[in-house]
Interface confidence: low
């Protein structure tokens, strides 16, 4: 007996061939010998079977012996043997329906878990794997399951389902919605307009929800909302912001803030949330502000850092195209009695400069002390 | 200002493959999708396909599917379209977009004329 | 894919005098309350320009004697007075679903 593997909304042809090569009488039946369709003539007739809508074959081929069964919008409980009655002989195929879908919706939130159901006929023992867009392969049987969805499952998940030697191919596609990235850090130097944005990794035509961004400041003892959101069709109107900081933010995505100012009492890590209609948890993404501050106070040159640095990042105080004259894994660094010049401030991670201030320091003219 | 300046008209046989580019300026490059439209001697507009500049991603009309290539380079903030097995009904002028919001174009470039001929 | 017919092909319109674009989609591009359909000028040798979007909206910058209506599956593009500059070719375009598609285009001539 052939067995073919069919799948779940999609159409399948069954072949049934004679020895002569024209159009001769045939019939197909299912195992309860219910007739589904066959010929008389030149005309093709239809049974009683629950096919009759989605049941047809192709008259075309009838003069060269070919007696196709076609079967449309295939339904799980379309698995049968069908038999082909022609000549005096019986062809007998075995079809066996298959479907796969993901649990929910095909749209999850990073961190999210994805289940993959197969819906197969009865008496049916497949095995299932599938293949993510980041090339990871997961076994099961009646379910499978990704638990921690990273941005890198977004895209066609191709799932293969065998039975008796022969494989049907799904292909899923998901969509992992999140920001294009997990954290970002700012660097300014105190004074210059700061820029925040946050884009999402995913696009829908539609997209609806609500954010808000907490703040906490370096400086600060705790947290505290520094602007809530609306986001509907993807326009984005704010609904309450701080009066200090005042933010001003896009009204269209990208999602972008706009920090009139860096001051050092705005340094920090804020924490910007997304939530989706229709969605369960809420996207993420951190973004971190740096402030660099470079001062003369009398006979003191200071330049500090507020913000989350790392403990690697270097920060000098040096007269332009000389040494540096201070270089320290600190947050603050001074130089007594400076030379008069352009002094700069620099931030730098192995070599690269991330942060750079200038500053004049004039020179002082020292009255004579008299006898 | 926004800018999307494309690469100079090419002349291609039958066969033969094109690498269109197309650079951008004046906004941030990784925060807008990129269309690749184009337009037959005389004819209407078609979208060929758009990627995504921060993560790579792409996604293609399923007529140029297996033919159209598009990539990316965020160090140049460039956008490149790749079509293989040129025929003479590709000769087109080639167009980047740059989406608004959705699939609206509201940034072109000034476009690059392709001729297929033997 | 959602198929964009224009009508006319052409048109010819005296200058200060109303022009009237029409464009059907093969099925309706409205989705919870907005309709997708965008409307561009083209001049020769010049890349598409967006004048509406989302049906209504006319794009910053562009003349405020343009103008977008319909929904659904008909829509329209009204040029209440036509100057000399807007002699061009004009498409509409649906941003519903993917791939975008265009309309054949309208060529708009002075008479």
């Known amino acids: 007996k052939k067995v073919v593997l069919g799948k779940k909304g999609d159409t399948v042809e069954l072949t049934c061939t004679a020895s002569q090569k024209k159009s001769i009488q045939f019939h197909w039946k299912n195992s309860n010998q219910i007739k589904i369709l066959g010929n008389q003539g030149s005309f093709l007739t239809k049974g009683p079977s629950k096919l009759n809508d989605r049941a047809d074959s192709r008259r075309s081929l009838w003069d060269q012996g070919n007696f196709p069964l076609i079967i449309k919008n295939l339904k799980i409980e379309d698995s049968d043997t069908y038999i082909c009655e022609v000549e005096d002989q019986k062809e007998e195929v075995q079809l066996l329906v298959f479907g796969l879908t993901a649990n929910s919706d095909t749209h999850l939130l990073q961190g999210q878990s994805l289940t993959l159901t197969l819906e197969s006929p009865p008496g049916s023992s497949p095995s299932v794997q599938c293949r993510s867009p980041r090339g990871k392969n997961i076994q099961g049987g009646k379910t499978l399951s990704v638990s921690q969805l990273e941005l890198q499952d977004s895209g066609t998940w191709t799932c293969t389902v065998l039975q008796n030697q022969k494989k049907v191919e799904f292909k899923i596609d998901i969509v992992v919605l999140a920001f294009q990235k997990a954290s970002s850090i700012v660097y300014k130097k105190e004074g210059e307009q700061v820029e925040f944005s946050f884009p999402l990794a995913f696009t829908v035509e539609k997209l609806t929800g609500s954010g808000e961004l907490w703040w906490q400041a370096e400086r600060a003892s705790s947290s505290k909302s520094w602007i809530t959101f609306d986001l509907k069709n993807k326009e984005v109107s704010v609904k309450r912001v701080t009066q200090d900081p005042k933010l001003q933010m896009g009204k269209k995505l990208p999602l972008h803030l706009t920090l009139p100012q860096a001051l050092p009492q705005y340094a920090g890590s804020g924490n910007l949330t997304l939530a989706l209609e229709a969605k369960t948890g809420k996207l993420h993404q951190e973004v971190n502000l740096v402030v660099m501050r470079a001062t003369q106070l009398q006979k003191n040159l200071t330049c500090e850092v507020w913000g989350p640095t790392s403990p690697k990042l270097m920060l000098s105080l040096k007269l332009e195209n000389k040494e540096a004259k201070v270089s320290k894994r600190e947050k603050a660094v001074w130089v007594l009695n400076p030379e008069a010049g352009m002094w700069q401030c620099l931030l730098s991670d192995s070599g690269q400069v991330l942060l750079e201030s200038n500053i004049k320091v004039l020179p002082t003219w020292s009255t004579p002390v008299q006898p | 200002q926004v800018q999307l300046v494309q690469s100079g008209a090419e002349v291609k046989k039958p066969g033969a493959s094109v690498k269109v580019s197309c650079k951008a300026s004046?906004?941030?490059?990784?925060?807008?999708?990129i269309s690749w439209v184009r337009q037959a001697p005389g004819q209407g507009l078609e979208w060929m396909g758009e990627i995504y500049p921060g993560s790579g991603s792409s996604y293609y009309n399923e007529k140029f599917k297996g033919r159209v290539t598009m990539t990316r380079d965020t160090s140049t903030s460039t956008v490149y379209m790749e079509l293989s097995s040129l025929r003479s009904e590709d000769t087109a002028v080639y167009y980047c977009?740059?989406?608004?919001?959705?699939?609206?174009?509201?940034?072109w470039g000034q476009g690059t004329l392709v001729t297929v001929s033997s | 894919d959602i198929v964009m017919t224009q009508s006319p092909d052409s048109l010819a319109v005296s200058l200060g005098e109303r022009a009237t674009i029409n464009c059907k989609a093969s099925?309706?591009?409205?989705?919870?309350?907005?309709?997708?359909m965008n409307w561009y000028q083209q001049k020769p040798g010049q890349p598409p320009k967006l004048l509406i979007y989302v049906a209504s909206n006319l794009e910053s910058g562009v003349p405020d004697r343009f103008s977008g209506s319909g929904s659904g599956t008909d829509f329209t593009l009204t040029i209440s007075s036509l100057q000399a500059e807007d002699v061009a070719v004009y498409y509409c375009q649906q941003s519903l679903q993917d791939p975008p598609t265009f309309g054949g285009g309208t060529k708009v001539e002075i008479k």
């Open positions: 977009a740059r989406s608004g919001d959705g699939s609206r174009f509201v940034y």
């Open positions: 004046g906004y941030t490059f990784t925060a807008y999708v």
């Open positions: 099925q309706s591009v409205d989705y919870d309350g907005d309709s997708y």
